[in-house]
């Protein structure tokens, strides 16, 4: 089977600050130098692209200046980085990996990772 | 809503070319994939091509290399498919396909028709 | 490249009747990766399931998809006068994207 399996983990609790990291590891059936990973969000049966980044094999993943997201590429490895996250912003997103060159051309989508936020609770006012 | 509304085709002699658009629209164009798909009258599908998001990678079944070009301009939401040294096999009816951002084809153009006879 | 075969070629059903459409891969695909598509004459052809047995969107509950591997199903669990079509699978794992050569669903 040439098919391509993208692992990521079930469930990430955003941190306090609304950043949520996590790994998506996929099983490469080509010699790719050329990936795109997506990450997709799915609420009901929409899914809406969050951020996209295309990289060369051994070199930086870099996401447009304005992206949510960062990331760092190891092998087939991609840390992935969702920042500015807020409570409705709770849901379950998807990994997606593109070998986009050269051909075949592959697709690998991950079952999703849960990510909950929780909004922090405002600061007290304090009366000195 | 996504719309995609595809023109050019027409009858030609073998040899001759032809090419096709397809004016998108409803939807963030760049990050999508777009597809030809095509299907000789009375028969199945077949795909033809494809063109990634930026422009720069493409794939082509293997009975169109070197003869099919497919572009993209993301500033007009419009895909083309250059067709060279047309043959009577290439006669058909050519969607044009979004690739949804899960991959299967979600959304289908009404088809234009290409006949190459002489 | 993967060869999909459909099976059979033609089904004659009544309306109300249930509808089993088969679709065989030459090598073990993802079910993350197979897509059914309707076609009626004249007509584009329409996504109905995708991942193998998800419903795309405002597809009826009467259409289900199933299978893993190298076999797969479409199932119309009780077929509607509208539903009288061709059906194709897909699979969309790996270039070229390649198509069965489609099951017809007539009237008996």
């Known amino acids: 089977c040439k098919a391509m399996h993208v692992a990521q983990p079930a469930v990430v609790l955003a941190s306090s600050r609304g950043i949520a990291s996590f790994v998506c590891e996929y099983a490469s059936p080509g010699k790719a130098t050329e990936v795109r990973v997506t990450v997709l969000r799915q609420a009901d049966s929409q899914v809406t692209e969050v951020c996209a980044a295309t990289y060369m094999m051994g070199n930086e993943l870099t996401f447009l200046d304005d992206s949510i997201c960062t990331g760092t590429s190891s092998g087939n490895q991609v840390n992935l980085t969702i920042q500015g996250l807020r409570a409705m912003d709770t849901g379950l997103y998807i990994c997606k990996v593109e070998l986009m060159y050269p051909p075949p051309y592959y697709l690998g989508i991950g079952n999703g990772t849960q990510i909950y936020v929780i909004d922090p609770e405002p600061c007290p006012d304090s009366d000195f | 809503q996504v719309q995609l509304v595809e023109s050019g085709g027409g009858e030609v002699q073998p040899g001759r070319s032809l090419r096709l658009s397809c004016a998108a629209s409803?939807?963030?164009?760049?990050?999508?994939?777009m597809h030809w798909v095509r299907q000789a009258p009375g028969k199945g599908l077949e795909w033809v091509a494809v063109?990634?998001?930026?422009?720069?990678?493409?794939h082509y079944v293997d009975s169109v290399k070197g003869r099919f070009t497919i572009s993209r301009d993301n500033s007009k939401n419009t895909v083309y498919l250059q067709m060279n040294s047309l043959r009577a096999e290439d006669s058909a009816v050519y969607y044009c396909?979004?690739?949804?951002?899960?991959?299967?084809?979600?959304?289908w153009g009404q088809g234009t028709l290409v006949t190459v006879s002489s | 490249e993967i060869v999909l075969t459909q099976s059979p070629g033609t089904l004659s059903l009544s309306p109300g009747e249930r509808a089993t459409l088969s679709c065989r891969a030459s090598?073990?695909?993802?079910?993350?990766?197979l897509a059914w598509y309707q076609q009626k004459p004249g007509q584009a052809p329409r996504l109905l399931i995708y991942?193998?047995?998800s419903r795309a969107t405002g597809i009826p509950d009467r259409f289900s998809g199933s299978g893993s591997g190298t076999d797969f199903t479409l199932t119309i669990s009780r077929l509607e006068p509208e539903d009288f079509a061709v059906y194709y699978c897909q699979q969309y794992g790996s270039s070229p994207w390649t198509f069965g050569q489609g099951t017809k669903v007539e009237i008996k």
């Open positions: 396909v979004r690739g949804g951002q899960l991959g299967a084809f979600d959304y």
């Open positions: 409803g939807f963030t164009f760049s990050s999508y994939g």
């Open positions: 991942g193998a047995s």
């Open positions: 063109i990634w998001y930026d422009g720069r990678n493409k």
């Open positions: 090598q073990s695909v993802s079910s993350s990766y």
